[in-house]
Interface confidence: medium
């Protein structure tokens, strides 16, 4: 599923991401835009043999199990395929674990490079939330 901007903002808000660990909803929508272009089925492979999955591009070395990543920790205790569902519950729950890990949203390279320090509220402007 490819979400619309406001559609995703509403879904993320429903799942309790607004101001989760101090990160406003705009941060999460911005991250999803530049990680996956709002596509729940996005997958991207990394040079270390891991793969990033889903709307927030969660990595198989640390957070989920895809059955083939050397030394996978599976800290979210889920199959990576669950992160590709049109229902974003699994991605959101895992993202909450990631953002609580100590580095906050710096864990997402696209957020660091494209969202951090920008007007992230623009990503939810005009949305009925």
């Amino acid at each position: 599923k490819v979400f619309g901007r406001c559609e995703l903002a509403a879904a993320m808000k429903r799942h309790g991401l607004d101001n989760y660990r101090g990160y406003s909803l705009g941060n999460w929508v911005c991250a999803a835009k530049f990680e996956s272009n709002f596509n729940t089925q996005a997958t991207n492979r990394n040079t270390d043999g891991s793969t990033d999955y889903g709307i927030l591009q969660i990595n198989s070395r640390w957070w989920c199990n895809d059955g083939r990543t050397p030394g996978s920790r599976n800290l979210c205790n889920i199959p990576c395929s669950a992160l590709l569902s049109s229902d974003i519950t699994a991605s959101v729950n895992c993202a909450k674990k990631i953002v609580s890990d100590g580095n906050g949203m710096n864990a997402w390279v696209a957020w660091r490079n494209r969202c951090k320090g920008t007007d992230v509220q623009a990503w939810i402007r005009g949305c009925r939330l």
């Epitope: 089925q41 043999g49 895809d66 059955g67 083939r68 050397p70 590709l84």
Partner: antibody, heavy 116, light 107 residues
């Protein structure tokens, strides 16, 4: 136990297309990548690409882009590989395997012969 | 693409001999190297994963070693059922690649 059952041998004419199937049992089909491998005598084993059945995400070896197309049907736990514009170079044994990084589980192989 | 070069291409041995098969990668692949045995008209069978981890059900006479670019599959006291082709495969990066194989044959 995990099993991958491939479709039977095919004899095709040059220029035709063929669709090979790989039925998986014994594990959660949608969760694991299915990989496809080609074997020709004297050419060893070549990785064609992979599909994640749960999402339909696919990756192809550059060499096989435009030649192979992967699909999967999660209702029947079956992965498919279509090969198009067949030539004699496509005559080979084609294997599906479960993608664990390594390949512990293989299909029995489908022999494709392309001949006029 | 990562190239895997296996040597020798053919190895002629007598049952009871011990042998070593080599697989060399064109760049470092850490320990992401796996070994397979294949008999005629059969699918490959996984022997060793991650350079040295013996797969369940594989006899202990098989062992693997190496890291980086140089890897070895050793068979301690070859038995008649061990004859066939041996392939290495890397999972360090895409595309996955295989070595050209070593044929283990009876002398």
């Amino acid at each position: 136990q995990v099993q991958l059952q491939e479709s039977g041998a095919e004899v095709m004419k040059p220029g035709a297309s063929v669709k090979i199937s790989c039925k998986a049992t014994g594990y959660t089909f949608s969760t694991y990548w299915i990989e496809w491998v080609k074997q020709r005598p004297g050419h060893g084993l070549e990785w064609i690409g992979e599909i994640l059945p749960g999402s339909g995400s696919t990756y192809y070896n550059e060499k096989f882009k435009g030649k192979a197309t992967f699909t999967a049907d999660t209702s029947s736990n079956t992965a498919y590989m279509q090969l198009s514009s067949l030539t004699s170079e496509d005559s080979a044994v084609y294997y599906c395997a479960r993608g664990d990084g390594w390949y512990c589980y293989w299909g029995q192989g489908t022999t494709l012969t392309v001949s006029s | 693409d990562i190239e895997l070069t296996q040597s020798p291409a053919t190895l002629s041995v007598t049952p009871g001999d011990s042998v070593s098969l080599s697989c060399r990668a064109s760049q470092s692949i850490s320990n992401n190297l796996h070994w397979y045995q294949q008999k005629p008209h059969e699918s490959p069978r996984l022997l060793i994963k991650y350079a040295s981890q013996l797969e369940s059900g594989i006899p202990s006479r098989f062992s693997g070693s190496g890291s980086g670019t140089d890897f070895t599959l050793s068979i301690n006291s070859v038995e008649t059922e061990d004859f066939g082709m041996y392939f290495c495969q890397q999972s360090n990066s895409w595309p996955r690649t295989f070595g050209g194989g070593t044929k283990l044959e009876i002398k």
